[in-house]
Interface confidence: medium
């Protein structure tokens, strides 16, 4: 999957664009909005009818090195009585993000963009049933 | 930055941390995943906290199209298909990294940008604070 060139005719390539070798691109990994923080409702992972846990994955050759993944705690959903109801289902919600992967080949180092699928949390859904015969 | 183990036979000049600027291959590794959530899953309709998906497009960003979730109701859908206001639909938000063209309009020069997206909604028990 290649990153598309700017296709719009009104985007003229500015003279100030840095020279880049063919087949590659220049990437500044000083993150814009680095200090932005998620302002989600408090403890939604525990208060949800489809609660989830978080696991931190760590990889020193990835930037950012930490990626947090959610896992649904239950097969079913938590009902009004606080019991698990298996007639409903807790399912994971996923979102793609980009990371930079560092690759070592002998003593040389190269960098590659990678799409990572992150499980963000869980939601409670009504099941869909298919009759197979 | 992040520290990595290095081949002891390599010259010492290599920085153990990620450099501020890197040259990366134009091909994105991993998946040609389906980035349209409307096609990849119907959770937004089947959920007890359903949501609508709004297309956010920006040609100066990669990916240029990002789908934002907005919860349809304040409450959650109960077993009878009605909105129950004793429970709340709330967005699940996630910080993701995207590429921002920098300088603007340059075809092969980018900077990482962190953006906050609402990915979907979940049904939660409300927290009620007594203020007086």
């Amino acid at each position: 999957r290649k990153i598309p060139k700017v296709g719009h005719t009104f985007f003229q390539k500015p003279e100030s664009c840095p020279p880049v070798p063919g087949g590659s691109m220049k990437l500044d990994i000083g993150i814009i909005n680095e200090n932005q923080r998620v302002s989600m409702s408090r403890n939604i992972e525990s208060r949800s009818t489809s609660p989830w846990n978080y696991t931190v994955t760590w990889d020193p050759n990835r930037y950012p090195s930490e990626v947090v993944q959610a896992q649904c705690r239950n097969l079913g959903c938590i009902n009004a009585q606080g019991k698990e109801d298996i007639s409903m289902n807790s399912v994971p919600i996923q979102q793609e993000t980009l990371v930079v992967r560092r690759k070592h080949q002998g003593c040389s180092v190269s960098f590659q963009l990678e799409k990572v699928l992150v499980t963000v949390g869980c939601t409670c859904v009504t099941p869909v049933i298919h009759h197979v015969q | 930055g992040i520290t990595i183990p290095r081949n002891p036979g390599c010259p010492n000049s290599e920085d153990k941390n990620f450099p501020r600027t890197v040259m990366v291959n134009l091909n994105i590794h991993n998946r040609n995943t389906n980035t349209n959530p409307k096609r990849s899953s119907d959770y937004y309709n089947r959920s007890t906290s359903p949501w609508n998906l709004h297309r956010n497009e920006d040609p100066e960003r990669y990916p240029s199209v990002i789908w934002e979730a907005k919860c349809r109701h304040l409450g959650c859908i109960n077993a009878d298909g009605n909105v129950d206001y004793h429970m709340n639909s709330v967005p699940i938000q996630q910080e993701i990294l995207v590429l921002r063209r920098e300088p603007p309009h340059c075809p092969n020069s980018f900077r990482l940008e962190k953006i906050l997206v609402s990915v979907g909604c979940t049904c939660v028990t409300p927290i009620v604070h007594h203020v007086a």
Partner: nanobody, 122 residues
């Protein structure tokens, strides 16, 4: 082609027991979550039990908890439901079901066969 064939139903008195079986074919049985669902006359499908691929995690609906036991034999591609202390409200057609996808739960299921009728009556 996925096939799920239920058997073991019948007429039983209240307080009695039955053991249902489901013979599965056409998919890698040992990789899938498996389920028992039932449909009482004039009602919708009711999820009564679920079992993880390795057999470790089991789930039961409140209406059957403590009376029914789900189990599986991956070598025989078979799913079982041991039903004890049966009540008249357990009267229904019982079906076995599997996850629609392997490895990633989406809340989609496949069920098949004609089911097996369980009638609890004195």
């Amino acid at each position: 082609e996925v096939q799920l064939v239920e058997s073991g139903g019948g007429l039983v008195q209240p307080g009695g027991s039955l053991r249902l079986s489901c013979a599965a074919s056409g998919f890698t049985f040992s990789s899938y979550w498996m389920y028992w669902v039932r449909q009482a006359p004039g009602k919708g499908l009711e999820w009564i039990s679920a079992l993880a691929p390795g057999g470790g995690n089991r789930y039961y609906a409140e209406s059957v908890n403590g009376r029914f036991t789900i189990s599986r034999d991956n070598a025989k591609n078979s799913l079982y439901l041991q039903m004890n202390s049966l009540k008249s409200e357990d009267t229904a057609v019982y079906y076995c079901a599997k996850d629609h996808n392997v490895g990633y739960r989406t809340g989609e299921y496949d069920y098949g066969g004609q089911g097996t009728q369980v009638t609890v009556s004195s």
